[in-house]
């Protein structure tokens, strides 16, 4: 089933993503796509990487993250109801079936009406009990070559469901780990 | 160290082609990108493509795809910018810059440039 | 495509004095923006990249900051040999795009 995240009309939405590079420089393409992840590919990419770069991405979708490093976590500018429903992440490792497809339900509330003005909240989650891959820190050298063959090796689970949307910010260091290689 | 050595001055007349090469020394070829700028009189940086010597992968941009074509010689380090069809705005100093992860595939090392003049 | 756009095309700035220069992104580029001069007659030359890391060898008196659209480059104190056109450009991206240029005269 998806994990389940939330944001207010008019916030950005944060859906989180990482994956561990096999050594620096070996990134994965990486796509996202709204609709829940399909046998291949993502079905209406909104945004996509290749081994270097961003190469496609339509507005208000955008990665803010160290994405050469494994942050592929998709930010999504100025949310409308619209925007509701589900979004594949989706890391395109090399090999057949060997994808790690990560299915995210996006909710979006309407925005609410205070009395007083209150800081806005950019990133708002629930229940970070999610099957994510981390990125690492940087490398001081680079060495460029063939993806090897891959090994994912899932590491430690999460604790304890967030269900306070204001503990969002904390959700980059949740989830478990998917190294590659 | 770290060497961009690229072909000199070209004239061409509109509708031809121009091949510029660039020999890298001083680094594992392989292990770097080679992306391609160019800069018209007096005008900015405009990016043109890059090529990946290790699988020989391309990324060009849009605005030339069709008319250029990146392509490497791994046994002498050379990688080659082809550009056809030229027009009289293609008129500029075409750069081969090494890229790498290190560095956020930034430009670190820079050839001289190759001026490509195209005049009937 | 990203367009970067950088303020102001041109100043002139007395020795010894702080420098800053603008680049603006039309959409969130991240920390991805590096930072180029290039001298008369010279190739580009890389200072920033990832918004704020010197490169290997540049001069502790440039710095760079900035995420998202707005991002800064500044010369703590100008010296004779920063005269120079200085061009950001966004590594987020296919295609990579650079600002038009700032021109960096001594007053």
């Known amino acids: 089933s998806e994990v389940e995240y939330r944001a207010e009309v008019g916030q950005n939405a944060y859906l989180p993503c990482f994956y561990t590079p096999a050594a620096p420089g070996n990134l994965v393409p990486v796509c996202w796509g709204k609709g829940a992840c399909p046998v291949f590919e993502c079905g209406n990419v909104v945004l996509r990487t290749d081994e270097r770069d961003v190469n496609y991405w339509t507005s208000r979708y955008w990665l803010n993250g160290d994405f050469r490093k494994g942050d592929v976590s998709l930010t999504i500018e100025n949310v409308t109801l619209a925007d509701s429903g589900i979004y594949c992440c989706r890391i395109q490792i090399p090999g057949i079936m060997n994808d790690e497809k990560f299915n995210l339900k996006l909710v979006i509330k309407p925005a609410k009406v205070t009395p007083a003005p209150t800081r806005q909240r950019d990133f708002t989650a629930a229940f970070p009990r999610m099957l994510t891959t981390r990125g690492h820190g940087p490398a001081e050298t680079q060495t460029l070559g063939s993806l090897p063959d891959i090994n994912l090796t899932q590491i430690s689970t999460l604790a304890n469901e967030l269900r306070d949307s204001r503990l969002a910010n904390d959700l980059r260091d949740s989830g478990a780990t998917i190294r590659i290689g | 160290q770290v060497q961009l050595v690229q072909s000199g001055a070209e004239v061409k007349k509109p509708g031809a082609s121009v091949k510029v090469s660039c020999k890298a020394s001083?680094?594992?070829?392989?292990?770097?990108?080679m992306d391609w700028v160019r800069q018209a009189p007096g005008q900015g940086l405009e990016w043109l493509g890059y090529?990946?010597?290790?699988?020989?992968?391309?990324s060009y941009n849009q605005k030339f795809k069709g008319r250029v074509t990146m392509t490497t010689d791994k046994s002498t380090s050379t990688a080659y910018m082809e550009l056809r069809s030229l027009r009289s705005d293609d008129t500029a100093v075409y750069y081969c810059?090494?890229?790498?992860?290190?560095?956020?595939?930034?430009?670190?090392?820079w050839g001289q440039g190759t001026t490509v003049t195209v005049s009937s | 495509d990203i367009v970067m756009t950088q303020s102001p095309d041109s100043l002139a700035v007395s020795l010894g004095e702080r420098v800053t220069i603008n680049c603006k992104a039309s959409?969130?580029?991240?920390?991805?923006v590096a930072w180029y001069q290039q001298k008369p007659g010279q190739s580009p030359k890389l200072l920033i990249y990832?918004?704020?890391n010197r490169y290997t060898g540049v001069p502790d008196r440039f710095s760079g900051s900035g995420s998202g659209t707005d991002f800064t480059l500044t010369i703590s104190s100008l010296q004779a040999e920063d005269v120079a056109v200085y061009y950001c450009?966004?590594?987020?991206?296919?295609?990579?795009?650079f600002g038009q240029g700032t021109k960096l005269e001594i007053k």
């Open positions: 959409q969130s580029v991240g920390n991805n």
């Open positions: 450009q966004q590594h987020y991206s296919s295609p990579s795009t």
């Open positions: 810059a090494r890229s790498g992860y290190g560095n956020y595939y930034t430009m670190d090392y």
């Open positions: 001083g680094y594992t070829f392989t292990d770097y990108y």
């Open positions: 990832y918004a704020s």
């Open positions: 090529i990946y010597p290790n699988n020989g992968g391309t």
